[in-house]
Every structure is written in structure tokens, then in C-alpha cells.
Interface confidence: low
């Protein structure tokens, strides 16, 4: 009888992660008697995948009834494939020996390649807020994909970004890969409603890329602009001074009125109005009893926004002038704006 040959007809098999791989193997003869074993890899470090004779291999099933005496089909199925299962699988015939079975002949091997989808991209922004005109970095990470070829793009509100760096790790052969990309984005005052999108395209996604997003509302801080104005009220000895706080984000804001440098009132922005661009406006007013003052009064509206150093604007209230003659007096002195970021 012709000497037994072990035939593995498939040089390679490509399987998607989570599916079942079928590894085909037939023998041309029943002689010599002995079991078949499947290994991943060759040489002394090879990994036993299935032993026809003994052992428990919960992920492996045989294609045909391997216990039948005349069976020469030793194909197996491996369930729930992961990228870690990639490698070359060998079907090896053993002949019965004593005390141990002896390796007799091996098949040529079947390379199992696993196509694994990338994980949903996770986009992370900076740990602290930044103001418009600043450049901030966003990172995008996706893991567990195979093969290595992958395309990553960045978008801001649908416009593709070009200032980014991408790495796919590891550089050499691996069962699966990770991608890490960092994009630089320049903030504008209109970015409260903006989104940064990381888009990953891979062969396993069949043309339907995965996207991760970050809302710039989590990243941006738009400092307020202040305007202090004065209006007379019906009572001749009273003046209504308003502080308009405009175009700020986020909402966290505290306003303090000072009269000649002394704190008059502190309040936290509550009933704000929202602008179309997502920023907020707020107004606070102070009713000043002019008759209580002999000299001119310096009124200061001081705003602390989002934990940043205070910004203030002052208004000189002339006590000597009749309030009604001052209705249009909007002269205001800016006592300094500090937009230093505290991260």
C-alpha cells in the first residue's frame, strides 16, 4: 500500500473574528494506525490545538465522526475565532508507539488569517478647557483590528483636517493592531457647537467606517465681554446700572458688583440666554441711591468665569450731575482683562 500522505488542501483560510474556522485535513491511508493531532506553529514551541485520542478541547469540533474506524477525514472547526488564533495550523499523523505515540507525517500547513474589526474609535480631548485661537490636541484610539492596513481621517464639522499624526502598532507582525492618532485643532469663538470626528476605515467594515466624536463644548472656554451702562429710573435719586455679560461659555460665571472698591453684591449666572452659536448672555443690574453718596461713585462689574482670573469693567457715576441728564452716559473704563488660562 502507498505510504500515507497528510493532505491539507488549503494553503490559507481567512476568517472574520467571532466566526468559525474550518481547517481541512485528510489522510490517504489508514496505515499506520495512530491518532491525528492538530498544532499551531511548528517546532518545539508548537501549541496543541486538538488531539484525536485524548484531552478536552471545548472550541474544537470534528467535521466528520472521527471515532469511526475507517475515517480518513481529520478536518476540524474552531469556534469563536479571535485575532489571537491567527497562525499556521498543522495536521500531524502519529503512529501508535510505546510508551508514547510517534510523529509520523505532517501536512503542509494551513495559514489562518483573522480579519478583526477595529474597536469603536475613542476620541479624547485635552484635560482642561482652552480659549479661542488656541491650538488643542485630540487623540483617537482604536484597537484589535487585523489585518494591519487601516485608514484614519479627522474632521471638524464635516471638514477634513490635515494637521494630525497617526501610528499603527506594533510595527512588526502581530495577531492584531492598534491605531493612535493625534490631531491639532485651532479653536474659534463659534466652536461651542462644533464636533471633532475621527473616522476609521478598514477592510472588515465593508465601506461603512467607524466614527468617534468629541464635542468641542467640553474643550472650549469663551471668555465674556462686558459692557456697563447707566439708565435713570423714575425716582430722581436712583440710577440703574447694568452689566451686560456677553458671549461666554461654559455657563459657570460669578459676578460681583463693587462700589468704590467695596463688594456690594455677588451673584451666580442662572437665567442666562443662549445665543445661536451656543454661547450665553447674561445681565445684572444694580440700583444705586445717588442721594446716599456725596462724591462720585466708581461702580465696577467684576466677573469670574469658569474659575479663571476675574475680568472687570468700571463705570464712573457722577453724583454732581442730575441723573436724568445722564441717561445716555455710557462712558466706561476697562480696568483690565486677564485671559490667562489655568489648566
Amino acid at each position: 500500500e502507498e505510504e500515507l500522505q497528510v493532505i491539507q488542501p488549503d494553503k490559507s483560510v481567512l476568517v472574520a473574528a467571532g466566526e468559525t474556522a474550518t481547517l481541512r485535513c485528510t489522510a490517504t491511508s489508514l496505515i499506520p494506525v495512530g491518532p491525528i493531532q492538530w498544532f499551531r506553529g511548528a517546532g518545539p514551541g508548537r501549541e496543541l490545538i486538538y488531539n484525536q485520542k485524548e484531552g478536552h478541547f471545548p472550541r474544537v469540533t470534528t467535521v466528520s465522526e472521527s471515532t469511526k474506524r475507517k475515517n480518513m477525514d481529520f478536518s476540524i472547526r474552531i469556534g469563536n475565532i479571535t485575532p489571537a488564533d491567527a497562525g499556521t495550523y498543522y495536521c500531524v499523523k502519529f503512529r501508535k508507539g510505546s510508551p508514547d505515540d510517534v510523529e509520523f507525517k505532517s501536512g503542509a500547513g494551513t495559514e489562518l488569517s483573522v480579519r478583526a474589526k477595529p474597536s469603536a474609535p475613542v476620541v479624547s480631548g485635552p484635560a482642561a478647557r482652552a480659549t479661542p485661537q488656541h491650538t488643542v490636541s485630540f487623540t483617537c484610539e482604536s484597537h484589535g483590528f487585523s489585518p494591519r492596513d487601516i485608514t484614519l481621517k479627522w474632521f471638524k464639522n464635516g471638514n477634513e483636517l490635515s494637521d494630525f499624526q497617526t501610528n499603527v502598532d506594533p510595527v512588526g507582525e502581530s495577531v492584531s493592531y492598534s491605531i493612535h492618532s493625534t490631531a491639532k485643532v485651532v479653536l474659534t469663538r463659534e466652536d461651542v457647537h462644533s464636533q471633532v470626528i475621527c473616522e476609521v476605515a478598514h477592510v472588515t467594515l465593508q465601506g461603512d467606517p467607524l466614527r468617534g466624536t468629541a464635542n468641542l463644548s467640553e474643550t472650549i472656554r469663551v471668555p465674556p465681554t462686558l459692557e456697563v451702562t447707566q439708565q435713570p429710573v423714575r425716582a430722581e435719586n436712583q440710577v440703574n446700572v447694568t452689566c451686560q455679560v456677553r458671549k461666554f461659555y461654559p455657563q459657570r460665571l460669578q459676578l460681583t458688583w463693587l462700589e468704590n472698591g467695596n463688594v456690594s453684591r455677588t451673584e451666580t449666572a442662572s437665567t442666562v440666554t443662549e445665543n445661536k452659536d451656543g454661547t450665553y448672555n447674561w445681565m445684572s443690574w444694580l440700583l444705586v441711591n445717588v442721594s446716599a453718596h456725596r462724591d462720585d461713585v466708581k461702580l465696577t462689574c467684576q466677573v469670574e468665569h469658569d474659575g479663571q482670573p476675574a475680568v472687570s469693567k468700571s463705570h464712573d457715576l457722577k453724583v454732581s450731575a442730575h441723573p436724568k441728564e445722564q441717561g445716555s452716559n455710557t462712558a466706561a473704563e476697562n480696568t483690565g482683562s486677564n485671559e490667562r488660562n489655568i489648566y
Epitope: 475613542v122 479624547s124 480631548g125 485635552p126 484635560a127 482642561a128 478647557r129 490636541s137 487623540t139 484610539e141 467640553e218 461654559p250 459657570r252 460669578q254 455677588t266 451673584e267 451666580t268 469670574e304 469658569d306 474659575g307 479663571q308 489655568i342 489648566y343
Partner: antibody, heavy 120, light 107 residues
Framework: QVQLVQSGAEVKKPGASVKVSCKAS????????ISWVRQAPGQGLEWMGW????????NYAQKLQGRVTMTTDTSTSTAYMELRSLRSDDTAVYYC?????????????WGRGTLVTVSS | DIQMTQSPSSVSASVGDRVTITCRAS??????LAWYQQKPGKAPKLLIY???NLQSGVPSRFSGSGSGTDFTLTISSLQPEDFATYYC?????????FGGGTKVEIK
């Protein structure tokens, strides 16, 4: 597993310096700030300062200004806090804490603490 | 700096009791307040963030309320594992500040 692992207890003499490390794992280190908080024996919690693991920016408590330095090493996902010119009232458990990722500051992940004893 | 004043400094209670701890900020901090639980020899654990939001994994018997300057932590039905020290912390601006702590002891 998401965790912050701190270096071991230290005994120092007055005037010396101590450097405590805090190694992060299980999350993207650069995405969060780290604060250092200390607790003297039998006392409450005292915030020492904050560092952005992303950009290295810092903000220190005024009383420690000039004596404390906070740094990060993104390659090892480790934050460091160095306190110089140690005094006996610096004896405390020093904690690193990760900010919870919100736009304000609270801490959802803490190290186990490092006991620093300052004694002559 | 924003001062945080906690009261009471200690409270004796029994299992099943309703316990309320208050925290007052020296100036308005909107809702930027967190509550922590600390047991002896352990690091603090975040219970409540943004004044009233329950941190993931924290039992629903803990609740927080308040805004501006006055805040409350409530334990609806005290359990044996709740005997600990509780701290409030403002996260509105630097420097971050903690309350002095409230020790919940067994009656």
C-alpha cells in the same frame, strides 16, 4: 484594571525632600489631570495642586508654592510630586487622584496613599 | 479662596437611621460640589458629583442636593458599612477646597 499605584512610605528628616510617584494604568493617562491631596494624621483632606497629564500645566496651593513641584512622564503614565524643605507638619498621607473628566474638578480614582513621615 | 464649612463635625446614628450632612460654601459655586466617603486607612471614594449625581457603583441610599452655597448629603437608611467620615469638596475653581469632614459614628 483602572488604577493609580503609588510609591511606598518614606521617612525623611526636616529640610530634606521627598518625591512620590503615582503610576496610572487601565486608561489613557494623557486624557485626565492629576491632583495631589494630603491628609495629616487625624486631620482632613488638603488639596496640594494639580497637573495636566496631557500638557504638564500645573496649579499649586498657595501655601506650598515654591516648595512643591508636580511632573508627569507620559511614556510611563506616571505622575510625580516632589516636596522640598520638609517640616514636621508635612507628615501626612499623600494621595494622587484622577479628575473625573468633567469640566469642573472632582476625583473618581485615587491612589492608596503614601505615608511621608518627617522626623528628626 | 472658597471656604467649605461642613456640619455637624460628627454624628451618632444607628443602622436604618436617616443621616443628613450639610456643607456651606463661602461664595456661590453653582453645582460644582462633590461628596466623598473615607474609611480609616483608606483613600476617599467619590459618592456624589455635581451636587446631586450619583457616581457609578454607589448605592442609591446616598443622595445629594443643593446649589449655590448650601448643599446636603443624605443617607436614607444607614447601613453598617456607611460608618465613615464624609467630606464635601468644591470643584468650581482653584484652589480646590474640602470641608472639614463629618464623622458618622455608631450610636
Amino acid at each position: 484594571q483602572v488604577q493609580l499605584v503609588q510609591s511606598g512610605a518614606e521617612v525623611k528628616k526636616p529640610g530634606a525632600s521627598v518625591k512620590v510617584s503615582c503610576k496610572a494604568s487601565g486608561y489613557t493617562f494623557g486624557g485626565y489631570g492629576i491632583s495631589w491631596v494630603r491628609q495629616a494624621p487625624g486631620q482632613g483632606l488638603e488639596w496640594m495642586g494639580w497637573i495636566s497629564a496631557y500638557g504638564g500645566e500645573t496649579n499649586y496651593a498657595q501655601k506650598l508654592q515654591g516648595r512643591v513641584t508636580m511632573t508627569t512622564d507620559t511614556s510611563t503614565s506616571t505622575a510625580y510630586m516632589e516636596l522640598r524643605s520638609l517640616r514636621s507638619d508635612d507628615t501626612a498621607v499623600y494621595y494622587c487622584a484622577r479628575e473625573a473628566g468633567s469640566s469642573w474638578y472632582d476625583f473618581d480614582l485615587w491612589g492608596r496613599g503614601t505615608l511621608v513621615t518627617v522626623s528628626s | 479662596d472658597i471656604q467649605m464649612t461642613q456640619s455637624p463635625s460628627s454624628v451618632s446614628a444607628s443602622v436604618g437611621d436617616r443621616v443628613t450632612i450639610t456643607c456651606r460654601a463661602s461664595q456661590g459655586i453653582s453645582s460644582w460640589l462633590a461628596w466623598y466617603q473615607q474609611k480609616p486607612g483608606k483613600a476617599p471614594k467619590l459618592l456624589i458629583y455635581a451636587a446631586s449625581n450619583l457616581q457609578s457603583g454607589v448605592p442609591s441610599r446616598f443622595s445629594g442636593s443643593g446649589s449655590g452655597t448650601d448643599f446636603t448629603l443624605t443617607i436614607s437608611s444607614l447601613q453598617p458599612e456607611d460608618f465613615a467620615t464624609y467630606y464635601c469638596q468644591q470643584g468650581a475653581s482653584f484652589p480646590i477646597t474640602f470641608g472639614g469632614g463629618t464623622k458618622v459614628e455608631i450610636k
